[in-house]
Interface confidence: low
């Protein structure tokens, strides 16, 4: 199998004329050291080819998980899930864009996009590196998390005197602690504006507004629909 034929991610599938959004199975790749992986592909948004790495929409899955679970991934690929840091790291080894889509409880949808996205390896604590921000989600609420390591309730890698993962009830690139908390607690309408450990994006709705829906998705920087 040549590199042109290989299927690495949803953009590879798109180029092979798989144009319907949904669940796909990426084959294992011995050269990349990646196992077979079930992914959800967004083949519609802004040209398609996006591999969804996170989704929050139902609140049925707890995101207050440990390091091993965030490494391997958890949840339901059709519902709420985290793809897994090891998988996301492998997917971002080529130059990659990140898109974050969010919806509030009033039904307004906003997005943030980053021209460059890298998740380093486990030895480097899945440190986050981001390029330039664009979008309409207010102030860039991931910039504060750029160049920070991933933390979970059992692995405190943040830049804070506090244990951010335990305080914000998630796994994330905590600094001290958050300008966003996309893996925080899912609060339903009525509770959505009362907590600081919710699914927050400070640049849009501030520190204690937990969003209704969030999706994080990636695709290669050089992707052409």
């Amino acid at each position: 199998q040549t590199s042109a034929d290989a299927i690495y991610d949803c953009s590879s599938l798109y180029q092979k004329n798989y144009r319907i959004s949904g669940v796909y199975r990426l084959p294992s790749n011995d050269f990349l050291g990646s196992p077979e992986l079930e992914v959800f592909c967004d083949m519609e948004t802004k040209g398609g080819g996006w591999t969804v790495i996170q989704r929050r929409k139902s609140g049925l899955v707890s995101f207050y998980r440990d390091w091993k679970q965030y490494k391997q991934g958890f949840g339901s690929i059709r519902g709420d899930f985290w793809l897994g840091n090891e998988h996301i790291h492998r997917l971002s080894r080529q130059p990659t864009r990140l898109r974050v889509e969010m919806e509030d409880w009033e039904g307004t949808v906003r997005y943030a996009e980053y021209s460059h996205f890298v998740l380093s390896n486990e030895l480097n604590s899945y440190r986050l590196f981001l390029g330039n921000y664009s979008g309409n989600a207010g102030n860039d609420a991931l910039y504060y998390h750029n160049n920070t390591a991933f933390s979970t309730k059992d692995k405190d890698n943040d830049n804070c005197l506090d244990k951010c993962a335990q305080l914000r009830k998630g796994g994330y690139w905590y600094n001290c602690c958050t300008d966003s908390n996309l893996n925080g607690v899912y609060y339903r309408l009525g509770e959505h504006d009362k907590h600081l450990d919710g699914i927050t994006w400070y640049g849009w709705h501030g520190a204690n507004y937990s969003l209704k829906r969030v999706e994080m998705k990636i695709r290669p920087e050089d992707f052409k629909p």
């Epitope: 504060y144 005197l161 506090d162 951010c164 305080l167 958050t178 600081l196």
Partner: antibody
């Protein structure tokens, strides 16, 4: 009820040492970061140092770095500030302050302070 | 280090007045800005955290706004017990820094 009680202040000569203590009660001490903040006579507030819940993270103001050492004993619910090589400009009321439970560098409870006077 | 500049350094006002104090950061600090009140001979008291969140037990006449570099503390209707010094503080990064303070005095 959260209570923070500082002690150990007093008159000390320049170049000498002093150790401040803060006894905490009314909350689970080892869940929270703690800080020292000082206020010179007739002056504003100045953050001195902070320490994480498990002493894993520690920070200092540039003005005290290398001279002051913050520590805590979670078993005794106590916070300490070892102050060496004291200078006249260290004269201040020293407050012990608790961080909030959402992981941020600010102070939701304060003690009443202990006065340190550095003078020959 | 991030410098915090508070203005005015002092002001005179009457009971019932609307009072506004501003704080400017030397670089963007998102919403990591907090406000404290200090009365003579007592420890500071937290009023507002995260730019606009009211600390539990603080009267609703106190409010905060702003993000980035410019922030405001507003007292909608000054009460006798509000005559005090007010400090802003950035909690974006260490070293933590305070504004120089604003003394609110009786006119």
């Amino acid at each position: 009820e959260v209570q923070l009680v500082e002690s150990g202040g007093g008159l000390v000569q320049p170049g000498r040492s002093l150790r401040l203590s803060c006894a905490a009660s009314g909350f689970t001490f080892d869940d929270f970061a703690m800080h020292w903040v000082r206020q010179g006579p007739g002056k504003g507030l100045e953050w001195v140092s902070g320490i994480g819940w498990n002493s894993g993270s520690i920070g200092y103001a540039d003005s005290v770095k290398g001279r002051f050492t913050i520590s805590r004993d979670n078993a005794k619910n106590s916070l300490y500030l070892q102050m060496n090589s004291l200078r006249a400009e260290d004269t201040a009321l020293y407050y012990c302050a608790k961080a909030p439970d959402y992981g941020d560098y600010y102070f939701d409870y304060w003690g009443q302070g202990t006065l340190v006077t550095v003078s020959s | 280090d991030i410098q915090m500049t508070q203005s005015p350094s002092s002001l005179s006002a009457s009971v019932g007045d609307r009072v506004t104090i501003t704080c400017r950061a030397s670089q963007s600090i998102s919403i990591y800005l907090n406000w404290y009140q200090q009365k003579p001979g007592t420890a500071p008291k937290l009023l507002i955290y995260a730019a606009s969140s009211l600390q539990s037990g603080v009267p609703s006449r106190f409010s905060g706004s702003g993000s980035g570099t410019d922030f405001t503390l507003t007292i909608s209707s000054l009460q006798p017990e509000d005559f005090a010094a007010y400090y802003c503080q950035q909690s974006y990064t260490t070293p933590l820094t305070f504004g120089g303070g604003t003394k609110v005095e009786i006119k």
